[in-house]
């Protein structure tokens, strides 16, 4: 068997496929490592762009399974990031394996909006929660920079009604409609027998990426009667 | 909607101190929704961050007022507090409150209160 002081000074291995990934702006590096006959260490390191004097920051140190959580390293989650990791084994080092640059607010997930539907008088009523990342709550785990441009600019609501489609924009920015809660949006209804369908997605301000869309609600107006 | 009232500001000498604070107030306003911040602007200058804490509480400065100014919040009072120590003439400015909503990114802006540092 293998041991450490037969490895050579390049003989430690380097990381591969170094990716980030992240859901409602919690990134996770993850890496792959070659099967070693002693156990690696892995050290992830950090640097944001944007930040004066930016250096490498310790984000994990010294673990040993194939992933880290690098929220707590984002400051500003429109702002370029990038990634670093080097294994050790022993007293030896890796080279750095690099990612390639991340914004968390650009290249991650968003989850969807929650939507609420009711019929009031001669229209219905949409109530778009905005997505849990951007309100308080138990889900809400990350904290970044407040003058992060990382937030909702407009909602395209999808409406479809006895098969066929409308598209709808609420503009967040718009105080009749919305606040930092929800925003809402009514749509005048037929007195025919209709079903309507309504699903949402927020885009994002400054790149348009869409959060995930919303389950589908359906509501069905027989009259002036209701069912949900 | 959301109104911000600044209070305190004034004349003060190099080297003192002065406290701003900044009412929030609205229907909808709560400062988990909202991240809190103050700005200033001398004359013939940008607009610039000095202090800003986020919804959850996490406080962010200006390198220039880093040690000097601290900035805080009582919830129960919808109030947000600037302490400015160890003032420098150069920091005579108008300091703006702002909310920033955290979904929206929508602005809210105070009167502006006048600091006057003298030497």
């Known amino acids: 068997e293998m041991g450490t002081a037969d490895l050579g000074p390049s003989s430690v291995p380097t990381p591969t496929n170094v990716t980030i990934e992240s859901y409602n702006m919690n990134p996770i590096v993850y890496w792959e490592y070659q099967i070693m006959p002693q156990v690696p260490v892995f050290t992830v390191e950090v640097k944001n762009y944007g930040v004066k004097n930016s250096e490498w920051i310790d984000a994990c140190i010294n673990i040993s399974h194939h992933y880290c959580n690098i929220s707590d390293h984002v400051g500003d989650p429109s702002n370029s990031l990038w990634v670093r990791v080097k294994a050790r084994v022993g007293q030896k080092e890796s080279a750095y394996a690099k990612s390639e640059e991340f914004a968390v607010c650009r290249d991650g997930k968003i989850g969807p909006p929650k939507l609420d539907i009711r019929k009031e008088e001669k229209q219905i009523m949409i109530d778009i929660f905005h997505p849990s990342v951007f309100v308080n709550g138990d889900e809400q785990e990350v904290d970044y920079d407040p003058e992060t441009t990382c937030y909702i600019r407009v909602y395209n609501v999808y409406v479809r009604m006895n098969g066929s489609e409308i598209q709808y924009k609420i503009l967040t920015q718009k105080e009749d409609d919305c606040d930092e809660i929800q925003c809402q949006l009514a749509i005048p209804v037929s007195s025919l027998n209709s079903q309507y369908c309504v699903s949402a997605e927020g885009v994002l301000h400054v790149w348009g990426v869409t959060t995930e869309k919303s389950k589908e609600v359906c509501i069905t107006i027989f009259n002036s009667s209701i069912k949900g | 909607q959301v109104q911000l009232q600044q209070f305190g500001g004034g004349l003060v000498q190099a080297g003192g101190s002065l406290r701003l604070s900044c009412t929030a107030s609205g229907s909808t306003f709560s400062f988990s929704n909202y991240h809190m911040g103050w700005y200033r602007q001398a004359p013939g200058k940008q607009r610039e961050r000095v202090a800003s804490?986020?919804?959850?509480?996490?406080?962010y400065y200006s390198d220039s007022v880093k040690g000097r100014f601290a900035i805080s919040r009582d919830t129960a009072r919808n109030t947000v507090y600037l302490q400015m120590n160890s003032l420098e003439p150069e920091e005579t400015a108008v300091y703006y409150c702002n909310a920033r909503g955290r979904a929206t990114g929508r602005d809210y802006w105070g009167q502006g209160t006048l600091v006057t540092v003298s030497s």
């Open positions: 804490i986020s919804s959850r509480g996490s406080t």
